[in-house]
């Protein structure tokens, strides 16, 4: 995970009342105990700050030490600051925990920019606003880092929720969620509702605000509207999926679908942007520029560098197109599409112009490591990581930012042939040559 581009975390706007339960769609499988319904104690358990990550409160050790931990579906290590650092208000003090066990093994994680390194151990871990359980989990105690912690972000560690295959130093280090499922009766599933406010928040607003929900072990119906649509997890390492078609304002980009997944497509809560392979990014930007051609913006804006500002309340959302990603469905030759608005892919930025302005960065960027469906995508949807059934579900989030004319959408089914051909098969490489990070 590279923290140069972190996700925007802003307060949720509304949503269904907690008591409201939407009727189950007729095409859904029968309910299973513990998988669906109300998870009141876990709703609204995420917080954060624009561009700096969604975090959950966790406790580590005995007696419990409370830390805020970044929720990251793009990595697989549970790692926490364990030494003083200028950007940390607090850190994990192993010597104060009677249940800490040293694994006598180091771990070093380099990123495209920056790195962290530390010492491996295990300790007792729980999530106060999560399931009422305590588990013994692997912990990387970060003793040294560079460009990893973010000044003012208010989190002190990272919870990697992906699979063991990408854990460091190797896949023998069991990730937290695997430990949780093994040691408790928590179902092998979690779901995320990341709520973007649509406007920047200052530090005090962030601390008082809701950033979303991480529902561990189930699905909460109050967090979404309409139906959940599922796409298969192609391979259990990252949360890899297959994109079969891309449209800008309904216009097909008309690329070989392999390009959309070159060299993979992943769902990653630890990345701010929607990141696209070079060829796809260029085609998408060309199409977005054409759709919004009544106004022109500098190249630096499309590179995600420059901010564009409008007088407060006058952002011309209507000139920017919607973006649809078609994902492989669970049924042969069937796909569904998720559609995001400019309210998701234009990221509000604080403290730059005057208070009379609304300023934004373009939050779609180029990738050399495949498509990354970061917060730009996830803030539009309630996303179910159904590990038990090796699938990821998408439904329209009850807290997504929209206007009176358009809304994010999850729609299907669509007939799409030869979807398996859209997946890219990465040549086997010596693991030491793989580059970690999300630049």
């Amino acid at each position: 995970t590279q923290h140069g581009i972190r996700l925007p975390l802003r307060s949720g706007l509304g949503g269904a009342p907690l008591g409201l339960r939407l009727p189950r769609e007729t095409d859904e499988e029968p309910e299973e105990p513990g998988r669906r319904g109300s998870f009141v104690e876990m709703v609204d358990n995420l917080r954060g700050k624009s561009g700096q990550g969604y975090y959950v409160e966790m406790t580590v050790g005995s007696p419990p030490q409370t830390l805020n931990i970044l929720v990251d579906t793009g990595s697989s290590n549970f790692a926490v600051g364990a030494a003083p650092h200028p950007f940390l208000h607090r850190y994990y003090q192993r010597q104060l925990s009677s249940t800490y066990r040293d694994l006598r093994k180091g771990v070093y994680v380099p990123y495209t920019q920056g790195k962290w390194e530390g010492e491996l151990g295990t300790d007792l871990v729980s999530i106060p606003h999560g399931p009422n359980v305590t588990v013994r989990a692997n912990i990387a105690a970060i003793t040294e880092s560079d460009k990893f912690f973010i000044n003012g972000s208010n989190w002190e560690g990272i919870l990697g929720l992906a699979y063991a295959e990408i854990a460091r130093p190797d896949d023998s280090l069991e990730p937290f969620f695997d430990s949780l499922v093994k040691q408790t009766h928590v179902p092998n599933l979690f779901s995320l509702q990341l709520c973007g406010a649509g406007f920047p928040l200052n530090q005090s607003e962030v601390l008082a605000s809701v950033g979303g929900s991480m529902i561990i072990g189930g699905i909460d119906h109050s967090l979404y509207t309409g139906s959940l649509w599922y796409t298969p997890i192609r391979r259990e390492w990252y949360y890899e999926v297959i994109i079969v078609r891309v449209e800008i304002n309904g216009q097909d980009l008309k690329m070989d679908c392999k390009e959309y997944n070159y060299d993979k497509s992943i769902v990653d809560s630890g990345t701010t942007n929607l990141r696209l392979p070079k060829k796809v990014f260029e085609a998408a930007v060309k199409s977005i520029k054409a759709a919004s051609s009544t106004e022109k913006f500098p190249d630096g804006f499309w590179l995600g560098e420059q901010l564009v500002c409008w007088q407060a309340g006058t952002t011309p959302w209507n000139i920017f197109p919607v973006i649809s990603l078609y994902l492989m469905g669970e049924v042969t030759n069937q796909s569904f599409r998720i559609t995001i608005l400019p309210q998701q892919y234009l990221r509000p930025v604080e403290d730059v112009a005057t208070s009379q302005d609304d300023c934004y960065k373009f939050a779609i960027s180029q990738s050399s490591t495949g498509t990354v469906m970061g917060a730009v995508i996830m803030e539009g949807f309630y996303v179910v990581f159904d590990r038990a059934r090796k699938r990821i579900g998408f439904a329209v989030s009850a807290c997504h930012v929209h206007d009176e004319f358009r809304t994010a959408a999850v729609e299907g089914p669509f007939v799409t042939l030869d979807m398996e051909d859209c997946g890219y098969n990465i040549p086997q490489t010596d693991e030491s040559t793989l580059m970690t990070g999300r630049a």
């Epitope: 500098p298 190249d299 560098e305 112009a353 300023c359």
Partner: antibody
Framework: QLQLQESGPGLVKPSETLSLTCTVS??????????WGWIRQPPGKGLEWIGN???????YYNPSLKSRVTISVDTSKNQFSLKLSSVTAADTAVYYC????????????WGRGTLVTVSS | EIVLTQSPATLSLSPGERATLSCRAS??????LAWFQQKPGQAPRLLIY???NRATGIPARFSGSGSGTDFTLTISSLEPEDFAVYYC??????????FGGGTKVEIK
């Protein structure tokens, strides 16, 4: 080569509307490569951006002047114009029109400027 | 709002000397900064864009450097025609709006 020339009255009474026109010669105002803008400079002071316009009519204004400013474009005449309402002595300045080039980022070509005095 | 502070306000030098002008932004503007020269009774002229690129027709004695918050305009050897007021402008926040207060380079 492309040139810009401001024109309009040099004296405006307080509370009235200042009106200036910038004529583009030697090139088309309808070029998709440029925005066109107005900048002013009170006597002996620094530069203040007023606003920009694209040939399609899309405008951006300085928030501090927004309520009083209108910039418009007339592609048939290859001109763009500035109107500033309810003027006071503080609006006395040299007014420049300019081209926003280099990828819509930098004022790379300027008119010679015209002094507008607000006085009764 | 991003504020650009130029220093010194006045620089008194002789022809042939090296001039170093500073522009500091209140927060990072990456490399999105320009330098303009303005002579009395004339319109400003673009000298440098993107912090270090010389505009068309600008002599090589003018150079720009810096990124983030600190920027420098250097005139390696002052010519008589270089005595003027110099302004910086940031375009990190678009549309371009913020100019610095200016530095006057005068003959000593």
């Amino acid at each position: 080569q492309l040139q810009l020339q401001e024109s309009g009255p040099g004296l405006v009474k307080p509370s009235e509307t200042l009106s200036l026109t910038c004529t583009v010669s030697g090139g088309s105002i309808s070029s998709s490569s440029y925005y066109w803008g107005w900048i002013r400079q009170p006597p002996g002071k620094g530069l203040e951006w007023i606003g920009n316009i694209y040939y399609s009519g899309s405008t951006y204004y300085n928030p501090s002047l927004k309520s009083r400013v209108t910039i418009s474009v007339d592609t048939s005449k290859n001109q763009f114009s500035l109107k500033l309402s309810s003027v006071t002595a503080a609006d006395t300045a040299v007014y420049y029109c300019a081209r926003l080039g280099h990828g819509y980022n930098y004022f790379d070509l300027w008119g010679r400027g015209t002094l507008v005095t607000v006085s009764s | 709002e991003i504020v650009l502070t130029q220093s010194p306000a006045t620089l008194s030098l002789s022809p042939g000397e090296r001039a170093t002008l500073s522009c500091r932004a209140s927060q990072s503007v990456s490399s999105y900064l320009a330098w303009f020269q303005q002579k009395p009774g004339q319109a400003p002229r673009l000298l440098i864009y993107d912090a270090s690129n010389r505009a068309t027709g600008i002599p090589a004695r003018f150079s720009g450097s810096g990124s983030g918050t600190d920027f420098t305009l250097t005139i390696s050897s002052l010519e008589p025609e270089d005595f003027a007021v110099y302004y910086c402008q940031q375009v990190y926040v678009w549309p371009p709006r913020t100019f610095g207060g200016g530095t006057k380079v005068e003959i000593k």
